[in-house]
């Protein structure tokens, strides 16, 4: 906290300009009017104040706006944003995408800080849903943003926003998140033709059910092994050898290298060895010939 001292004669700031970088902290406190600062916030970012000096400017704004800053000030915070705590940000009402972009720009190149996370949370809650423009902006700054949301939060993403999602945005998503995103993607891309549809839907397939994988196997999509390995195990298990062969196309040979890993390992255990042999890959571990397979889960469902 800077001591309250009278402003030296002739040092009262008439505008926010470069001369203020030569002021000591106590002089900034005494000589800069908070209301002047608020109306000329757009100049602050262009002036190379030290972080210590920015602390003083923040303190002045805090005194002027104890209930939280207005958006006209927030939009021009610039480097001063780095001085804000999540508690400060929770008092804000940020509605403009331009304001959000301006503040994300300040933090560009850094990990998502608690301040940024709070800002995004306030913004999205204020909007009621993650619309396409917001999602576009957030994933541009933080490719992993989507995967940082809970399945509940993802449920507020409208299908139209899915067009903004790039494959790398989903890299860190877990199956529960893809379970929520996949139906939205399916809806978003439903009017595309086969090959185009597959290109778009591919990153979301970790949330696809068995029947959709079966349908894809009829469309000569040639799914790569990396995508196949991210599929839900419970969705892969019911696929026949013929369906997997059609689904993977020329990539089917890659199954051999992955035979000890899920979901390939579990899928092999469910297939007849005879059927596996037709692939000519030397996959082992299938059900021996002459064995009867009882699906107990189906039996329980019937009784």
């Amino acid at each position: 906290e800077v001591e309250k001292t009278a402003c030296p004669s002739g040092k009262k700031a008439r505008e926010i300009d470069e001369s203020l970088i030569f002021y000591k902290k106590w002089e900034l406190e005494a000589c800069v009017d908070a209301a002047l600062l608020a109306t000329q916030m757009d100049r602050v970012n262009a002036i190379p104040f030290t972080y210590e000096q920015l602390d003083v400017l923040k303190h002045k704004l805090d005194e002027l706006y104890p209930q939280g800053y207005p958006e006209s000030v927030i939009q021009h915070l610039g480097y001063l944003f780095l001085k804000m705590s999540p508690e400060d940000i929770r008092k804000w009402n940020v509605t403009s995408l331009e304001t959000l972009k301006a503040l994300l720009e300040v933090n560009k190149g850094h990990e998502m800080s608690p301040q940024v996370a709070t800002l995004i949370d306030r913004f999205v809650k204020g909007r009621g849903q993650l619309d396409k423009d917001t999602l576009d902006t957030l994933t541009a700054f933080y490719p992993g943003y989507l995967c940082s949301l809970s399945p509940e939060e993802l449920s507020s993403v409208p299908p139209s926003s899915i067009w903004a999602v790039r494959p790398q945005d989903l890299d860190t998503c877990d199956p529960r998140q893809l379970d929520v995103l996949y139906p939205k993607a399916r809806l978003a891309f439903q009017n595309m033709n086969g090959s185009e549809y597959f290109v778009k839907i591919q990153s979301f397939l970790g949330g696809a059910p068995t029947e959709d994988l079966k349908a894809l196997s009829q469309q000569n999509v040639s799914m790569d092994l990396a995508t196949f390995m991210k599929l839900r195990t419970d969705a892969v298990l019911p696929l026949t050898v013929a369906e997997v062969q059609k689904l993977l196309g020329p990539h089917v040979e890659g199954l051999k290298a992955e035979e000890r890993h899920r979901p390939v390992r579990d899928w092999i255990l469910r297939q007849r060895q005879d059927d596996l042999d037709t692939l000519g890959l030397g996959l082992q571990g299938g059900i021996p010939n002459g064995y009867l397979v009882l699906d107990l889960s189906m039996q329980e469902a019937l009784s």
């Epitope: 972080y51 920015l54 480097y79």
Partner: nanobody, 115 residues
Framework: EVELVESGGGSVQAGETLRLSCTAS????????MGWYRQAPGDECELVST???????NYADSVKGRFTISQDNAKNTVYLQMTSLKPEDTAIYSC?????????WGQGTLVTVSS
Amino acid sequence: EVELVESGGGSVQAGETLRLSCTASGFTFDDSDMGWYRQAPGDECELVSTISSDGSTNYADSVKGRFTISQDNAKNTVYLQMTSLKPEDTAIYSCRTMASRIGCWGQGTLVTVSS
């Protein structure tokens, strides 16, 4: 990695002259605005002088007419020529890129002016 090494400090009598040097590496020196800061014992950090990439200079009121900032882009060095030194100029002097916003931090070079 940005590195700034200050030198030229020392003990002098009031009225004498010193020339501080700051040699920079790890960034594009001739595109950067540079500044000299100082911190006296028990006092707070103060910006003394700045020089922008276009060569324009600015000074704190307390040193105007006595201190001169300059730079040599070929040597990646910024200088602070200090004349008519006063006891109140006693401080640790540090040079910084203005974009760093960190003010008085790091080693610096000590200037002691006795009356």
